[in-house]
């Protein structure tokens, strides 16, 4: 089956959600780990990640269609210390499959705002930190 990983971001007030979404078949969930790394060009692994999610097979989902599993990493207030390059990755201990998402970046600017760039589908988010709105 076709397995892929995408990265996205959303804002709720001052909170920034970084989301790693893995699309896979139901039976492929077992043994899969999704993880998010920061500033790790070569050694992104569950052990060096900021957060990881171990997928479990959900017997409640019928059929063999494609399903998605999400890892959400929430930053309550983005600060200059969050500036850097992030990457969503996944791997299967069962099949040996390794997935690496596109690199995306958080840049905290001198004005106190931040931008998230490099997301799939040319998604470019610019946030005003103080106002907590999408600008």
């Amino acid at each position: 089956g076709c397995i892929n990983i995408t990265s996205s971001a959303s804002q709720e007030g001052t909170r920034l959600n970084l989301i790693c979404t893995v699309w896979h078949k139901k039976e492929e969930a077992e043994g899969f780990v999704v993880f998010l790394c920061k500033d790790r060009s070569g050694d992104c692994s569950p052990e060096t990640s900021l957060k990881q999610l171990r997928l479990k097979r959900d017997p409640g989902i019928d059929g063999v269609g494609e399903i998605s599993s999400q890892l959400m990493f929430t930053i309550s207030q983005v600060t200059p210390l969050h500036s850097g390059t992030y990457q969503c990755c996944a791997r299967s201990q069962k099949s040996g499959i390794r997935l690496q998402g596109h690199f995306f970046s958080i840049l905290f600017t001198e004005t106190g705002n931040y931008t998230v760039t490099g997301l799939k589908q040319r998604q470019h988010l610019e946030f005003s930190h103080n106002e907590g709105t999408l600008s």
């Epitope: 500033d39 207030q77 200059p80 210390l81």
Partner: antibody
């Protein structure tokens, strides 16, 4: 278990230098931004400086800018605070602390090291 | 720079009493964190993001507030709660600021 152990404190004359170290264990040090927070005798807490996980970005409170330098060695799981041109008002217990990645709280603190600046 | 003003600066409470410590910010802030510090010890995170209790903190503690006014409340004061409590916030560009502390003693 997370452990932060500071060292390098002591008595120093005004205008002189001192370098503090903080040895970290029990977590993936290279993933976390780190900070120094100080507390003058019988006084409150005061943030001094922070450094990002990779060590490339540093931030300071205005009163120590140009005199203090925060740095880290991820291979040694250690962060440092180089303190130059010390003043009597720098006398304090200096705490090493970790930045919580998802929040702006300092979640782990060392036991602190005393720095006394006096002639 | 945002200034955090804690009140009272010190207080004494009886066991079982309800205690409220307030922290006022000179400008609106998004979240407030609270730390507990006992004599000779390091500060411990106690309440974070205004109302979330840190690991191991008894549920007699609670936090609330928004904008410029925040508070930490102890529902039934116990002897082990005697300590100094500090509020803390983050904003740009002054970064991290703390209140001057509230010393809480037991009768």
């Amino acid at each position: 278990e997370v452990q932060l152990v500071e060292s390098g404190g002591g008595l120093v004359q005004p205008g002189r230098s001192l370098k503090l170290s903080c040895a970290a264990s029990g977590f993936t040090f290279s993933n976390y931004a780190m900070a120094w927070v100080r507390q003058a005798p019988t006084k409150g807490l005061e943030w001094v400086a922070s450094i990002n996980s990779g060590g490339g970005n540093t931030y300071y409170r205005d009163s120590v800018k140009g005199r203090f330098t925060i740095s880290r060695d991820n291979a040694k799981n250690t962060q440092y605070l180089q303190m130059d041109s010390l003043r009597s008002e720098d006398t304090a217990t200096y705490y090493c602390a970790t930045h919580n990645y998802e929040s702006t709280v300092f979640d782990y603190w060392g036991q602190g090291v005393m720095v006394t600046v006096s002639s | 720079e945002i200034v955090l003003t804690q009140s009272p600066t010190s207080m004494t409470a009886s066991p079982g009493e309800r205690v409220t410590i307030t922290c006022r910010a000179s400008s609106s802030v998004s979240y407030m964190h609270w730390y507990q510090q006992k004599p000779g010890a390091s500060p411990k995170p106690w309440i974070y993001e205004t109302s979330k209790l840190a690991s191991g903190v008894p549920d007699r503690f609670s936090g609330s507030g928004s904008g410029t006014s925040y508070s930490l409340t102890i529902n039934n004061m116990e002897a082990e709660d005697a300590a100094t409590y500090y509020c803390q916030q983050w904003n740009y560009p002054s970064m991290y600021t703390f209140g001057a502390g509230t010393k809480l003693e037991i009768k």
